[in-house]
């Protein structure tokens, strides 16, 4: 149940895909990754107001309970709904290798 | 890559399963659910400090970038890693029906 995509907080304020440029040093990968030297990291950032991109029934419950008990129950959180793979050239015991990571770059986002 | 389960913030402060008691009225279900009248909602609540229960590579990246750019990149968030099903007796056009919801109760938690 992927609920409404209209953001009541204003354009770009709600849960959506953002791109953050990061170097291998930023990521703490400089000692084991050779390439790429810089990664365009796609990640899910933004608020999750009532029923906005609710991932499932659990997210809907969380919204209801957060409204009732905001100090106990946090609002739903903006997280990846799916991922794009990314291939790294990484150091190994014997030299270097290509390795695909399936859970590295967010592809789209929802609230949960 | 499910990283460390030791919470550096103190017992019970980090991402874990909590149970919140909620009535049908609390959940906004009173008009379409007959039973149960009260739900022990299991949900994921708590902080996600560095590498605590990191769900995957994306979560590890998020931790690194949050440390560097806390105003831009949020910390990882405590969300369900899996769910327990729940059966509801619900009203239908023709009477009542048993319906299983697979994504209603959190079973365990991780940070993403």
């Amino acid at each position: 149940a992927r609920n409404g995509d209209h953001c009541p907080l204003g354009p770009g304020r709600c849960c959506r895909l953002h791109t953050v440029r990061a170097s291998l040093e930023d990521l703490g990968w400089a000692d084991w990754v050779l390439s790429p030297r810089e990664v365009q990291v796609t990640m899910c950032i933004g608020a999750c107001p009532s029923q906005f991109r609710a991932a499932n029934m659990h997210a809907q419950i969380k919204t209801s309970l957060h409204r009732l008990k905001p100090d106990t129950v946090p609002a739903p959180c903006c997280v990846p709904a799916s991922y794009n793979p990314m291939v790294l050239i990484q150091k190994t015991d014997t030299g270097v290798s290509l390795q695909t990571y399936d859970d590295l770059l967010a592809k789209d986002c929802h609230c949960i | 890559a499910r990283n460390g389960d030791h919470c550096p913030l103190g017992p019970g402060r980090c991402c874990r399963l909590h149970t919140v008691r909620a009535s049908l009225e609390d959940l906004g279900w009173a008009d379409w659910v007959l039973s149960p009248r009260e739900v022990q909602v299991t949900m994921c609540i708590g902080a996600c400090p560095s590498q605590f229960r990191a769900a995957n590579m994306h979560a590890q990246i998020k931790t690194s970038l949050h440390r560097l750019k806390p105003d831009t990149v949020p910390a990882p968030c405590c969300v369900p890693a899996s769910y327990n099903p729940m059966v509801l007796i619900q009203k239908t056009d023709t009477g009542v029906s048993l319906q299983t919801y697979d994504d209603l109760l959190a079973k365990d938690c991780h940070c993403i």
Partner: antibody
Framework: EVQLLESGGGLVQPGGSLRLSCAVS????????MTWVRQAPGKGLEWIGI???????YYASWAKGRFTISRDNSKNTVYLQMNSLRAEDTAVYFC???????????????WGQGTLVTVSS | DIVMTQSPATLSVSPGERATLSCQAS??????LAWFQQKPGQPPRLLIY???TLASGIPARFSGSGSGTEFTLTISSLQSEDFAVYFC????????????FGQGTKVEIK
């Protein structure tokens, strides 16, 4: 001694299939990525694809769908399965150790001598 | 698709002279580049990897430079055994990985 030896080449009709083998000796195949490259007579080198040490495969866009790289670490052998062969696939096919743009430890230049595939009716 | 473009196609040089070969990538490949030398009937021989690192057993007259999309192979003083065809190879990685060779530069005796 570290060696790579390609085999399985020969004459095949257009539309046919062929499986090339690259038998390695002197090192443990399971630790290394392996690359296939081809060279048409009198032409340049053409990158076909790589199989990583974990078994992931990566192909040139023109090779996707027709060519498949696999490996059997227990037999210390890498394979190149070629389907729907065309006259323009006529070439010497080489296997090489590593991803080539970065060197593995030890010997930096491990190529087989190649095996000739001729596609003709 | 990644495309590697080498120039010139043919380079005529006298022994003892300097030779400069260029390779351009259609994508930013950082230093994911190697240079190979090939002589007739032989497999390619690795000269330079990681854009600028000399492979073992290769004479110091060979050097590589560049990163991103522009790369150069320099042979400081050509010897008779250096007359051959030279290929660059680039590997681009992001959501997938793909490699491509340049079309080659033939270094011939002037």
């Amino acid at each position: 001694e570290v060696q790579l030896l390609e085999s399985g080449g020969g004459l095949v009709q257009p539309g046919g299939s062929l499986r090339l083998s690259c038998a390695v000796s002197g090192f443990s195949l399971s630790s290394y990525d392996m690359t296939w490259v081809r060279q048409a007579p009198g032409k340049g080198l053409e990158w076909i694809g790589i199989i990583s040490n974990s078994g992931s495969t990566y192909y040139a866009s023109w090779a996707k769908g027709r060519f498949t790289i696999s490996r059997d670490n227990s037999k210390n052998t890498v394979y190149l399965q070629m389907n729907s062969l065309r006259a323009e696939d006529t070439a010497v096919y080489f296997c090489a150790r590593g991803i080539l743009v970065y060197a593995d430890y030890g010997d930096h230049n491990l190529w087989g001598q190649g095996t000739l595939v001729t596609v003709s009716s | 698709d990644i495309v590697m473009t080498q120039s010139p196609a043919t380079l005529s040089v006298s022994p003892g002279e300097r030779a400069t070969l260029s390779c351009q990538a259609s994508e930013d490949i950082y230093t994911n580049l190697a240079w190979f030398q090939q002589k007739p009937g032989q497999p390619p021989r690795l000269l330079i990897y990681a854009a600028s690192t000399l492979a073992s057993g290769i004479p110091a007259r060979f050097s590589g430079s560049g990163s991103g999309t522009e790369f150069t192979l320099t042979i400081s003083s050509l010897q008779s055994e250096d007359f051959a065809v030279y290929f660059c190879l680039g590997v681009y990685t992001y959501i997938s990985a793909e490699g491509a060779f340049g079309q080659g530069t033939k270094v011939e005796i002037k």
